[in-house]
């Protein structure tokens, strides 16, 4: 019976565990995407509505704080588009790019994490173009530290939810 | 205040060019797109072509297409149409009409037109 | 090539009376309308764009209203100076016209 007790304890106490690890997933807020042709900050996106969640970590002036030490998976799914109905492309020659950065507090700096992109040429001849990036990696992150998302011009990003997101999860403890 | 200022009327025998001139003031010239638009007797307005001010890049009408040239002096802060070979259906108000989106914050050229030159009538006649 | 449909051409409405334009676009355009004002011998004058957004200066008696296919410009209480012809607009492609007048 002791044992049993001892089981079903460990199990407790392994899936309080895995409800603890911090995860978010984050999704572009349409209503707020900010103007330019040039690499901005996305600072508004949804933690809590959609598709969005957030548990154990905190999302505070567009930026994904980190609340515990640890291994993280980063990712970010970026889609650029434009159809004619919305009016001409002012250049058809284009660079479209995501910047995953990480910002410290503490020692303040700032590192690009992970970039991904293409230089596109979107003839005016077509009614549509869409362009997608995908980025992803494994990060030692620390309490405190913050994860922000840059991209060039934002007048062309996808605003769903499933078009244009990124978040983390926390895969394992540092030693 | 912003403003388009075009050139006075032309009378031009058919086959002959036009040029017509818009100048802008009131706003950084460079920053937005000029759109020329005209208006034959009794039609609708007819969109004829946009220059991007900033990097002279240009689109026109498929209808225009070979007989329109647009371009800009941005020293002069001044867009320019010509039009060849013209014919007697080439009668018209000729327009220039700044495009709403500044392209400083955006790369979408958006055909609101938030400001108009008076216009130009050219008279194509033999 | 999307193609711009109003009705009517032409109407007569007296002082104070609620005038309404209607623009059809052969295909959905989602917001992407603008409607202007035009007098002989003026510049033409943007109204309302993004189907009902209305222009810096514009007086509130004018309105606009609807997405996809099929919009509407309302004059709540028409003033003598509206007497003029209206145009929709989306993208290259512009409506007939509306001419407005006095009765």
């Known amino acids: 019976e002791k044992a049993m007790v001892d089981g079903s304890w460990l199990d407790l106490a392994k899936r309080s565990k895995l409800e603890a690890q911090p995860f978010a997933h984050l999704t572009i807020n349409a209503t707020d995407i900010p103007s330019g042709s040039h690499k901005v900050s996305l600072s508004s996106w949804y933690h809590d509505r959609g598709w969005a969640k957030i548990s154990n970590m905190t999302f505070s002036n567009g930026k994904l704080i980190v609340n515990q030490d640890g291994f993280y998976y980063l990712y970010a799914n970026i889609c650029f588009r434009h159809h004619e109905t919305s009016g001409d492309l002012a250049t058809e020659y284009l660079q479209l790019m995501v910047y995953v950065t990480k910002t410290s507090i503490k020692i303040p700096s700032s590192h690009t994490l992970m970039k991904g992109g293409s230089t596109k040429y979107w003839s005016g001849n077509s009614e549509f173009h869409f362009y997608s990036i995908n980025v992803g990696g494994f990060f030692k992150l620390r309490s405190g530290e913050e994860i922000s998302i840059e991209v060039s011009n934002p007048s062309l990003l996808d605003p769903d939810q499933d078009a244009t997101y990124f978040g983390a999860f926390k895969v394992r403890d540092i030693d | 205040q912003v403003q388009l200022v075009q050139s006075g009327a032309e009378v031009r025998k058919p086959g002959a060019s036009v040029k017509v001139s818009c100048k802008a003031s009131?706003?950084?010239?460079?920053?937005?797109?000029i759109h020329w638009v005209r208006q034959a007797p009794g039609q609708r307005l007819e969109w004829m072509g946009w220059?991007?001010?900033?990097?002279?890049?240009?689109k026109f009408s498929q209808k225009f297409q070979g007989r329109i040239t647009v371009t800009r002096d941005t020293a002069a802060s001044t867009a320019y149409m010509e039009l060849r070979s013209l014919r007697s259906e080439d009668t018209a108000v000729y327009y220039c009409?700044?495009?709403?989106?500044?392209?400083?914050?955006?790369?979408?050229?958006?055909?609101?037109?938030?400001?108009w030159g008076q216009g130009t009538l050219v008279t194509v006649s033999s | 090539e999307i193609v711009m449909t109003q009705s009517p051409s032409s109407l007569s409405a007296s002082v104070g009376d609620r005038v309404t334009i209607t623009c059809r676009a052969s295909?959905?355009?989602?917001?992407?309308l603008n409607w202007y004002q035009l007098k002989p011998g003026k510049a033409p004058r943007l109204l309302i764009y993004?189907?009902?957004s209305l222009q810096s200066g514009v007086p509130s008696r004018f309105s606009g209203s609807g997405s996809g296919a099929e919009f509407t410009l309302t004059i709540s209480s028409l003033q003598p100076e509206d007497i003029a012809t209206y145009y929709c607009?989306?993208?290259?492609?512009f409506g007939q016209g509306t001419k407005v007048e006095i009765k």
């Open positions: 295909q959905s355009i989602s917001r992407y």
């Open positions: 009409a700044r495009d709403s989106s500044q392209m400083v914050r955006g790369i979408i050229i958006a055909y609101y037109f938030d400001y």
């Open positions: 607009q989306h993208t290259r492609a």
């Open positions: 993004g189907a009902s």
């Open positions: 220059i991007n001010a900033g990097n002279g890049n240009t």
């Open positions: 009131g706003y950084d010239f460079s920053n937005y797109a």
